[in-house]
């Protein structure tokens, strides 16, 4: 059997010889020794006997999407039965006083391959047997502690493979320089070590992107917006947009990066080199945000101009790598591509409440039969649209120990002046957060109060 | 002067449906919260709902809650009550009211019946 | 049984003073402004007193509002005739999200 037998066969086999190869990677033409790595259907029963206890599941993750020519990395992660687990010496045990179905078991080992690799013979004095080898018979590499690796997983995509030795967890990166743009499928074979063989113990599949198109995303923030999530936002408030750009390769760390704005208010574009920006919107309604990300990445160079023929016949020149006009076939030459992201957003602009302040606080005269408590009433102003709600979270000094939350509707007039008040339990110095909401913003103002012990000549006093 | 005027009231069987509304006048509707109240026959006054100005906001009381639907037109001055599901224990007048920390001005109230 | 505890009756002869009080929470009364309402037999109710002390305009100061900790009481003075009414006082509840009402105070005015 070959490769691609084995390992599905998304695409034609002859998909690799119309694209260059990936690096380290090889033809799923090649053999698979199938007597070592036994090739199980789905549906087979003996899926059912691969591993003690239950089934392994396979997690594949990438860091997909990916700019064309940076490096994409897949991770897979082994998730085994309940109570299982691997140690320190890539065995499998039993976690302590776990239960599951079986109860508690009392060998500590799933797996204990330590065990079995002292007792296999055979081996020559490199510890290298023709058993410690991989589907396509290349030899494991031997880097310290390679014994305590005992699960064989094997990626294919693009009609190549890549085979790699690991514990519960490995990760693969791939260069996408040489990779078709759109969505591509990455299959990966899992196999355990079983005595002398290898038995399959889960496969798993998932796309992944490749583009040219730079990945953009933008977070927006507001001070009052109650929802940064829901892409409405506050008049005459500004608003932070911060561009993210997915590049976990940094393919694009030494790149010049720009950003060029359209904010839909007839502002005009804005053009930085920093990715974020305040913008300010003084009208209500809906306004279509654009941003335009250009980047000058690493690129293919293009094919050079075809030599000018010369009108009698000249003498050779040499070796073909000494005539400049060869230089751009140089594959290390550093060439540059402009790059270019988008990213589009409709955005809602309301009225919304700009400002709270406390302009006065009072301490509310009570009857004596409850001395140990004190009524403050404080005044407050704010600015932009009626609010609905007040909330008060008084903590300690620190402003850090919250004792006391209290939410309530607050009717107010179109001035925008009410008095809330609050009981506060003992003297003491009290930090006051205090917010002011509607349905689309929340204006905060803080203060710290002291409350004079029940004294009737000590005055209430904002403290600092 | 402030007039707040109920409607919609009536006798329904357990299980319908009655939409109660209150048009308002003498006042800025749109600028100002709104609330139900009601009253069983012999009874205390028992909270119903409330709504914030632009309606973004709504309250329910427990009792209402999933069966009851507060909303308002202010280009209309109008307040809603959408009562679904009625229950003979729904059985009260019911009075539309400005505001929702306190009610300032009240309507004369609506009887709504809840009989087999 | 409502969360803010009325006395069920009240009574006073022409001229006196007369206390009602109402019980509640530090998540209503002790945190939140207590309102009172008047209920005259077959009409609506009718706000008395808000912010826990405050009267609106038109209701005698013979009316007065107070608040102690998680306790309010309404105090008429000068009792009438026209005093005989239910009252019932009330205030947002920050726990339940919800107003809350006392179960009322019938007021007898006496001779």
């Known amino acids: 059997k070959r490769f691609h037998d084995v390992l599905g066969n998304e695409r034609p086999s002859a998909y690799m010889r119309e694209h260059n190869q990936l690096n380290g990677w090889s033809s799923d033409e090649n053999d698979w020794n199938e007597k070592l790595y036994p090739v199980w259907k789905r549906g087979d029963m003996r899926w059912k006997n691969s591993w003690k206890g239950g089934r392994v599941q396979a997690v594949l993750t990438s860091d997909s999407p990916a700019l064309v020519g940076s490096n994409i990395t897949f991770a897979v992660n082994l998730i085994f039965p309940r109570c299982q687990k691997e140690d320190a010496n890539g065995n499998i045990v039993y976690e302590k006083n776990c239960r599951n179905e079986a109860g508690l078991s009392a060998d500590p080992y799933v797996y204990n391959w330590t065990a079995w690799s002292e007792d296999s013979d055979g081996e020559n004095g490199t510890g290298q047997s023709h058993h410690n080898v991989f589907p396509d018979g290349k030899p494991f590499p031997h880097h310290p502690g390679w014994r305590r690796w005992n699960f064989i997983y094997v990626f294919h995509t693009l009609g190549q493979y890549f085979q790699k030795l690991g514990r519960c967890s490995v990760r693969v990166s791939v260069n996408t320089a040489n990779v078709t743009l759109g969505p591509q499928l990455m299959e990966v074979t899992v196999y355990r070590r079983h005595g002398r063989a290898y038995v399959p113990i889960a496969q798993v599949k998932d796309v992944y992107v490749v583009t040219d198109q730079i990945p953009v995303f933008v977070t927006m923030f507001q001070k009052n917006d109650r929802n940064s999530s829901d892409e409405t936002f506050l008049k005459d408030l500004p608003i932070m947009f911060d561009v993210l750009i997915h590049d976990p390769s940094h393919f694009l760390n030494y790149s010049t990066i720009n950003y060029k704005w359209s904010f839909g208010d007839n502002t005009g574009l804005f053009v930085s080199t920093n990715h974020t920006v305040n913008h300010t919107y003084v009208l209500n309604g809906t306004f279509s945000l654009n941003l335009t990300v250009k980047a000058a990445a690493p690129g293919p160079c293009p094919p050079p101009p075809p030599p000018p023929r010369p009108s009698k016949p000249t003498p050779s020149l040499g070796p073909a790598g000494d005539n400049p006009l060869e230089l751009s076939r140089i594959p290390d030459e550093n060439c540059q591509i402009n790059r270019y992201g988008h990213f589009q957003a409709t955005i809602t602009i309301v009225e919304g409440i700009l400002e709270v302040n406390i302009i006065q606080m009072t301490d509310v005269l009570m009857p004596v039969p409850w001395p140990e408590s004190s009524l403050i009433d404080f005044v407050v102003t704010c600015q932009g649209s009626i609010p609905t709600e007040v909330c008060t979270i008084i903590s300690d000094p620190t402003c850090e120990i919250t004792q006391n939350t209290v939410c309530s509707p607050v009717d107010v007039d179109e001035m925008c002046l009410l008095t809330v008040r609050r009981t506060f339990n003992g003297s003491g110095t009290y930090c006051v957060n205090l917010t002011l909401g509607d349905d689309t913003s929340l204006a905060l103002t803080s203060t710290l109060i002291s409350v004079p012990d029940r004294d009737p000549a000590s005055p209430l006093r904002m403290a600092n | 002067e402030v007039q707040l005027l109920e409607s919609g009231g009536g006798l329904v069987q357990p299980g319908g449906s009655l939409r109660l509304s209150c048009a308002a006048s003498?006042?800025?509707?749109?600028?100002?919260?709104m609330s139900w109240v009601r009253q069983a026959p012999g009874k205390g006054l028992e909270w119903v709902s409330s709504?914030?100005?632009?309606?973004?906001?709504?309250y329910y009381a427990d009792s209402v809650k999933g069966r009851f639907t507060i909303s308002r037109d202010n280009s209309k001055n109008t307040l809603y009550l959408q009562m679904n599901s009625l229950r003979a224990e729904d059985t009260a007048v019911y009075y539309c009211?400005?505001?929702?920390?306190?009610?300032?001005?009240w309507g004369q109230g609506t009887l709504v019946t809840v009989s087999s | 049984q409502s969360v803010l505890t009325q006395p069920p009756s009240a009574s006073g002869t022409p001229g006196q003073r007369v206390t009602i009080s109402c019980s509640g929470s530090s998540s209503n009364i002790g945190n939140n402004y207590v309102s009172w309402y008047q209920q005259l037999p077959g009409t609506a109710p009718k706000l008395l007193i808000y912010?826990?002390?405050q009267r609106p305009s038109g209701v005698p100061d013979r009316f007065s509002g107070s608040k102690s900790g998680t306790s309010a009481s309404l105090a008429i003075s000068g009792l009438r005739s026209e005093d005989e009414a239910d009252y019932y006082c009330?205030?947002?509840?920050?726990?339940?999200?919800?107003?809350?009402f006392g179960g009322g105070t019938k007021l007898t005015v006496l001779g």
């Open positions: 912010a826990d002390s």
């Open positions: 009211a400005r505001k929702w920390s306190t009610f300032d001005y």
């Open positions: 709504i914030s100005h632009s309606g973004g906001s709504k």
């Open positions: 009330g205030a947002w509840d920050s726990s339940l999200n919800a107003y809350v």
């Open positions: 003498g006042f800025t509707f749109a600028a100002r919260p």
